[in-house]
C-alpha cells in the first residue's frame, strides 16, 4: 500500500472549487461531497455560485468529478497502478484540453490535494471559440449522462500519467456531441509515485437535481472502478 | 472566531487613488469567495465587487468598473481594493464580507472613505 | 438586473409582530437574505436561504417567500430590535449581490 493510499481507507469530505471563462461568460462553481475509494463512489453537490451557469453542467462533470480519481476503485490486484492515491497528500496538477466536435474547446488546470481532511479539487477552466447557438453555449444537452472508459498510461518523463478518452453527450434531438480529452496529471511533491501499466477507469455516473435548491446546481452520484490489466500468473497458482 | 478587518481608508481628493486592505482570520480564507459592499452616509447598501476563492474571477457593480480593482493573497489571508480615479460619490463606508455560495455571511467593521476637496 | 423594493419604514408596538415585506419579479424563484444594521455598526445575517436562521439570531426571527414578496417577520418584537433590515438576493454574474434599499423599523 502506496503512503498516499492509506488517506482513502474510509470517506473522505471532497470540497470543489472551479472558475471559469467560456467565450468571456465568466461564473464560478462550488462543490462539496464525500469520496469512499472503497467502493470508488463519489457523491457530489455543485451550485453556481455566479447565478445561472453558462454552458450545460454535463460539459463540466469530467472536469468536477473525472478529476478527483484519487476516489476509483483499484482492485486488489492493480493497487500498484494506482498513480493518483500515490500522489497524496501533496496532490497533483491536472491538465486538460477537451475538444468538442464542430464547436469549441476547454483547457483546464487544477491541483487536487488534501488540505486536512479533505480533498479539494481546484480548477481553472477557459474556453474558446463555441457557437453562440451551438450544443454548447445553446444548451442542447440533455441533463444526463453516459457510462465511459478513461484509458490510462504512464508518462515516464514527467513522473506522471497521460490520459485520453471520449465523452458522448447527448443532445436533445436524439444525436451525440463528442468530446475529446487529452489529459495530463504531474505530482505536486516530489516523493515517489506509482507509474502504472496501461489500464482504463471504468466510469457510471447519475446526475439529478435536488427538488429544494432554487438556485442552479448539479447533483453528481458516480462510481469507479480500474480495469485492464489481469492478475499475474503468480496469482493463478496462489 | 472569524474575523475580517478593513484598513486603508481615509480622506483623498477627487481623482486620487485608494487601497483598501482586509485582513481575515478564524476560518480557511483560500475556500471562500470575498466581496466589498459599501454605504453611503445615510444610505443604503451597494454591492461595488467580488473575487472568487481561487481569485482568477472577478466582478464588478457598473458604477466602478474600469476604475476599482479586487485582488486577494490567499497567503497572507488578505483581501485588497484598488480605487482609482475616486469621485466624490464615492464616498462611503467600505465593508469586507466573506461570499458563502450565493451570500454574505460575516461582515467586517468598515473603513469610511471620504472624496472631498 | 432584478430589483428589490422595501418600504422605507415601519413602526411596531413592543411585543407585537412586525412584517417587512421585499418585493421583486418572481422572487420566490430565488433565496432571499436578510441582514439587520443598527447604527454605527456592520449588517448581521439573521435570515439566509428565504427561512433559514444563522446559530445565535433569536427564534422570533422568520423568513418566507413566493410569488414576487419575501418576508421578514419579527414576532414579540423587542426594543433591541430597532434597526435598519435589508433584504438582498443574488443576480446574474453581471451583478453578483442586489439589496433592497433598506427598511426602518421603530419600536414605539
Known amino acids: 500500500m502506496s503512503k498516499g493510499e492509506e488517506l482513502f481507507t474510509g470517506v473522505v469530505p471532497i470540497l470543489v472549487e472551479l472558475d471559469g471563462d467560456v467565450n468571456g461568460h465568466k461564473f464560478s462553481v462550488s462543490g462539496e461531497g464525500e469520496g469512499d475509494a472503497t467502493y470508488g463512489k463519489l457523491t457530489l453537490k455543485f451550485i453556481c455560485t455566479t447565478g445561472k451557469l453558462p454552458v450545460p453542467w454535463p460539459t463540466l462533470v469530467t472536469t468536477f468529478s473525472y478529476g478527483v480519481q484519487c476516489f476509483s476503485r483499484y482492485p486488489d490486484h492493480m493497487k500498484q497502478h494506482d498513480f493518483f492515491k500515490s500522489a497524496m497528500p501533496e496532490g497533483y496538477v491536472q491538465e486538460r484540453t477537451i475538444f468538442f466536435k464542430d464547436d469549441g474547446n476547454y483547457k483546464t488546470r487544477a491541483e487536487v490535494k488534501f488540505e486536512g481532511d479533505t480533498l479539494v479539487n481546484r480548477i481553472e477552466l477557459k474556453g474558446i471559440d463555441f457557437k453562440e447557438d451551438g450544443n454548447i453555449l445553446g444548451h442542447k444537452l440533455e441533463y444526463n449522462y453516459n457510462s465511459h472508459n478513461v484509458y490510462i498510461m504512464a508518462d515516464k518523463q514527467k513522473n506522471g500519467i497521460k490520459v485520453n478518452f471520449k465523452i458522448r453527450h447527448n443532445i436533445e434531438d436524439g444525436s451525440v456531441q463528442l468530446a475529446d480529452h487529452y489529459q495530463q496529471n504531474t505530482p505536486i511533491g516530489d516523493g515517489p509515485v506509482l507509474l502504472p501499466d496501461n489500464h482504463y477507469l471504468s466510469t457510471q455516473s447519475a446526475l439529478s437535481k435536488d427538488p429544494n435548491e432554487k438556485r442552479d446546481h448539479m447533483v453528481l452520484l458516480e462510481f469507479v472502478t480500474a480495469a485492464g490489466i489481469t492478475h499475474g500468473m503468480d496469482e493463478l497458482y496462489k | 472566531q472569524v474575523q475580517l478587518v478593513e484598513s486603508g481608508g481615509g480622506l483623498v481628493q477627487p481623482g486620487g487613488s485608494l487601497r483598501l486592505s482586509c485582513a481575515a482570520s478564524?476560518?480557511?480564507?483560500?475556500?471562500?469567495?470575498m466581496h466589498w459592499v459599501r454605504q453611503a452616509p445615510g444610505k443604503g447598501l451597494e454591492w461595488v465587487s467580488g473575487?472568487?476563492?481561487?481569485?482568477?474571477?472577478?466582478y464588478y457593480a457598473d458604477s466602478v468598473k474600469g476604475r476599482f480593482t479586487i485582488s486577494r493573497d490567499n497567503s497572507k489571508n488578505t483581501l485588497y481594493l484598488q480605487m482609482n480615479s475616486l469621485r466624490a460619490e464615492d464616498t462611503a463606508v467600505y465593508y469586507c464580507?466573506?461570499?458563502?455560495?450565493?451570500?454574505?455571511?460575516?461582515w467586517g467593521q468598515g473603513t469610511l472613505v471620504t472624496v472631498s476637496s | 438586473d432584478i430589483e428589490l423594493t422595501q418600504p422605507p419604514s415601519v413602526s411596531v408596538a413592543p411585543g407585537q409582530t412586525a412584517r417587512i415585506s421585499c418585493s421583486g419579479d418572481?422572487?420566490?424563484?430565488?433565496?432571499v437574505y436578510w441582514y439587520q444594521q443598527k447604527p454605527g455598526q456592520a449588517p448581521v445575517l439573521v435570515i439566509y436561504?428565504?427561512?433559514e436562521r444563522p446559530s445565535g439570531i433569536p427564534e422570533r426571527f422568520s423568513g418566507s417567500n413566493s410569488g414576487n414578496t419575501a418576508t421578514l417577520t419579527i414576532s414579540g418584537t423587542q426594543a433591541e430590535d430597532e434597526a435598519d433590515y435589508y433584504c438582498?438576493?443574488?443576480?446574474?454574474?453581471?451583478?453578483?449581490?442586489?439589496f433592497g434599499g433598506g427598511t426602518k423599523l421603530t419600536v414605539l
Open positions: 478564524g476560518f480557511t480564507f483560500s475556500r471562500y469567495g
Open positions: 436561504g428565504d427561512d
Open positions: 473575487i472568487s476563492s481561487i481569485g482568477s474571477n472577478t
Open positions: 438582498a438576493s443574488y443576480d446574474s454574474s453581471h451583478i453578483l449581490i442586489v
Open positions: 418572481n422572487l420566490g424563484k430565488k433565496y
Open positions: 464580507a466573506r461570499w458563502y455560495k450565493t451570500y454574505i455571511d460575516v
